[in-house]
């Protein structure tokens, strides 16, 4: 297993609709490779997998239909979008990139993006 550098933004603020987007960039030493991107959430020293996708470098990446993540890829960059976030989902979201095949296998883990989610204030009832 060889190490690979992965870069991602330090902080992202989710939109009022609970959507957060960030770029995960990896320094790939190989050519066309099967790549696996995993988003991990770290909160209170617990790490859980949010979503994962495997794709061919240069092609689109597809998450499972029921995934809360969507994304596009361009070269060595993956543009990730996480939806349906609520205040309780605030935490550190880590991008993990694996160059799966062919060997050599490379693994890179970013420092994480702190995503802040603020639940929108409920709209006050109004008389028309």
């Amino acid at each position: 297993c060889k190490a690979m550098h992965v870069a991602q933004p330090a902080v992202v603020l989710a939109s009022s609709r609970g959507i957060a987007s960030f770029v995960c960039e990896y320094a790939s030493p190989g050519k066309a490779t099967e790549v696996r991107v995993t988003v991990l959430r770290q909160a209170d020293s617990q790490v859980t997998e949010v979503c994962a996708a495997t794709y061919m470098m240069g092609n689109e990446l597809t998450f499972l239909d029921d995934s809360i993540c969507t994304g596009t890829s361009s070269g060595n960059q993956v543009n990730l979008t996480i939806q349906g976030l609520r205040a309780m989902d605030t935490g550190l979201y880590i991008c993990k990139v694996e160059l799966m095949y062919p060997p050599p296998y490379y693994l890179g883990i970013g420092n994480g993006t702190q995503i802040y989610v603020i639940d929108p204030e409920p709209c006050p009832d109004s008389d028309f």
């Epitope: 030493p29 190989g30 050519k31 066309a32 490779t33 061919m56 060997p103 050599p104």
Partner: antibody, heavy 119, light 111 residues
Framework: QMQLVQSGAEVKMPGSSVRISCKAS????????INWVRQAPGQGLEWMGW????????GYAERFQGRVTLTRDTSISTAYLELSSLRSDDTAVYYC????????????WGQGTLVTVSS | QSALTQPPSASGSPGRSVTISCTGT?????????VSWYQQHPGKAPKLMIY???KRPSGVPDRFSGSKSGNTASLTVSGLQAEDEADYYC???????????FGTGTKVTVL
């Protein structure tokens, strides 16, 4: 013990296509990558490409790009190699072989399929 | 893609040893411990004899051993037997080509 069994010999006309099958038994089809290698008469081994049976993703040797297609049918644990625009120098024995993701070993190998291209 | 370089032939008397070399570059043989060796008898499929430079699959006699120094890998067959007469190929992944490369092949003759 995993076994790979390939389809029988083929005789093809120049310009046509050939499709070879490689059926896996005795183990999980989707956990290891399938590679294809060919050997022309009296020549050495030549790697053609790989396929991930789990995702269907493929990678090809540069010289075969555009002429080779690797596919699979996971329901019958079978991988396929299709080679198009056949020429006489494509006459060879074609082998499939299994490769764990983080290893350089090809094991086991199919018994081979002889493809003869002749008019 | 360019093949790894092997001597075309090697020979030895029964009971003696023979060593086959496989020379590549830092992108393949020298860069990773992925070198495998395959034995091929006429009309048969290749058989894995050594993988990851030194490892032997179960069922392969311990007369077969592998090693590596720099960009050159070697296969040694000690205590040669008649059934060891075959073609031997090295193979490894090439990190710059993202391809598997084989050696040119060595015909081993037991005298």
């Amino acid at each position: 013990q995993m076994q790979l069994v390939q389809s029988g010999a083929e005789v093809k006309m120049p310009g046509s296509s050939v499709r070879i099958s490689c059926k896996a038994s005795g183990g999980s089809f989707t956990t290891h990558f399938i590679n294809w290698v060919r050997q022309a008469p009296g020549q050495g081994l030549e790697w053609m490409g790989w396929m991930n049976p789990n995702t269907g993703n493929t990678g090809y040797a540069e010289r075969f790009q555009g002429r080779v297609t690797l596919t699979r049918d996971t329901s019958i644990s079978t991988a396929y190699l299709e080679l198009s625009s056949l020429r006489s120098d494509d006459t060879a024995v074609y082998y499939c072989a299994r490769n764990p993701a983080e290893s350089g070993r090809f094991d086991p190998w199919g018994q081979g399929t002889l493809v003869t291209v002749s008019s | 893609q360019s093949a790894l370089t092997q001597p075309p032939s090697a020979s030895g008397s029964p009971g003696r040893s023979v060593t086959i070399s496989c020379t590549g570059t830092s992108n393949n043989v020298g860069g990773y411990n992925y070198v495998s060796w395959y034995q091929q008898h006429p009309g048969k499929a290749p058989k894995l004899m050594i993988y990851e430079v030194t490892k032997r699959p179960s069922g392969v006699p311990d007369r077969f051993s592998g090693s590596k120094s720099g960009n050159t890998a070697s296969l040694t067959v000690s205590g040669l037997q008649a059934e060891d007469e075959a073609d031997y190929y090295c193979g490894t992944w090439d990190g710059s080509l993202n391809a598997y490369v084989f050696g040119t092949g060595t015909k081993v003759t037991v005298l």
